[in-house]
Amino acid sequence: APVPPGEDSKDVAAPHRQPLTSSERIDKQIRYILDGISALRKETCNKSNMCESSKEALAENNLNLPKMAEKDGCFQSGFNEETCLVKIITGLLEFEVYLEYLQNRFESSEEQARAVQMSTKVLIQFLQKKAKNLDAITTPDPTTNASLLTKLQAQNQWLQDMTTHLILRSFKEFLQSSLRALRQM
């Protein structure tokens, strides 16, 4: 797996040690995760034909993946930085159970899947520091997450492949929207 941002020897020597909440640091963290998702998508698409499948709706019924909507204030139209920051953090927290599901779904990219999961945890910490004054952030219920995980793992092979593909695609879209929004914060 690639070296996470801030752990590269060039960075360590750099005199401009940035606070963890700095715009550049958060941006780098998101891009690092996106690179990881890219690698995972490559394996998924090579292994199955899910990336071209038109039957996504069947699997999507079982999933409640976080998605940006107008009301979340993360788009150019109706942008609201406080509402949006809450949505980004809440969404990332909700994605964690799905990232846990991905952990045993990869053969050659097992390390990459772990890196995406761990880097997301770090990103959440960065953003929570940035949003220290916001108290509207709800954490998902562990019991609900555990039963969701069990349900997802009990699916047949085709649905598991499709679920993996949908999680990666949705997470990528969520992070790209977050990147655009955070630029204006």
């Epitope: 940035q18 891009r31 139209s77 942008f79 204006q184």
Partner: antibody, heavy 118, light 109 residues
Framework: EVQLLESGGGLVQPGGSLRLSCAAS????????MSWVRQAPGKGPEWVSR????????YYGDSVKGRFTISRDNSKNTLYLQMNSLRAEDTAVYYC?????WGSGDYWGQGTLVTVSS | QTVVTQEPSFSVSPGGTVTLTCGLS?????????PGWYQQTPGQAPRALIY???DRHSGVPDRFSGSISGNKAALTITGAQAEDEADYYC?????????FGGGTQLTVL
């Protein structure tokens, strides 16, 4: 068409204060972070300050920290820069600019000249 | 304080290609620094050419292009014209602030 119009510049004595304004039109002002950039005569541009789209976060260059305050009024589509304890080295043309993003670049105004001299 | 470095001056023949660079005194330039390029002619406000590494500002001719090459941001002018003679400044987001380079004076001769 994006337009940014700075005003409020002028001649002020060292130690004095000045408040710059920037009236924005032609884009969704409340969706963009905004910056002030200055350029001293014969020098390159120097970033001064930035404020987030909703006004919740502000950032400053080392040379103005503690003396300048950036603010905005999204209901009036206006950006401000309150400059206190002015020094001769603050003499420059001050430009306001929106932060590139949402698929479009940054636009700059034509600037307002601030001269700090006794 | 991280310094943003640019070549002080450069010259190019009309029709020629020139690449101006923008680096950091320590570390590499990445997409997270959102490299931007500005052109300034005497008596005028700086004009944005490129934002976010390689996106061309509206109305900017396609002979101007941006990239990250190696550990630096780069502005390439392909088929330079007399009106391209100007000062060129790059800007990088570093942490929470923005730093401008000292500028490159480009001569077209």
């Amino acid at each position: 068409e994006v337009q940014l119009l700075e005003s409020g510049g002028g001649l002020v004595q060292p130690g004095g204060s000045l408040r710059l304004s920037c009236a924005a039109s032609g884009f969704t002002f409340s969706s963009y972070a905004m910056s002030w950039v200055r350029q001293a005569p014969g020098k390159g541009p120097e970033w001064v300050s930035r404020i987030s789209a909703g006004g919740g976060s502000t950032y400053y260059g080392d040379s103005v920290k503690g003396r300048f305050t950036i603010s905005r009024d999204n209901s009036k589509n206006t950006l401000y820069l309150q400059m206190n304890s002015l020094r001769a080295e603050d003499t420059a043309v001050y430009y306001c600019a929106n932060r590139a993003g949402w698929g479009s670049g940054d636009y700059w105004g034509q600037g307002t000249l601030v001269t700090v001299s006794s | 304080q991280t310094v943003v470095t640019q070549e002080p001056s450069f010259s190019v023949s009309p029709g020629g290609t020139v690449t101006l660079t923008c680096g950091l005194s320590s570390g590499s330039v990445t997409a997270s620094n959102y490299p931007g390029w500005y052109q300034q002619t005497p008596g005028q406000a700086p004009r944005a050419l490129i934002y976010s590494t390689n996106d061309r500002h509206s109305g900017v001719p396609d002979r101007f292009s941006g990239s990250i090459s190696g550990n630096k941001a780069a502005l390439t002018i392909t088929g330079a014209q007399a009106e391209d003679e100007a000062d060129y400044y790059c800007a990088l987001d570093i942490g929470d602030i923005t730093e401008f380079g000292g500028g490159t004076q480009l001569t077209v001769l």
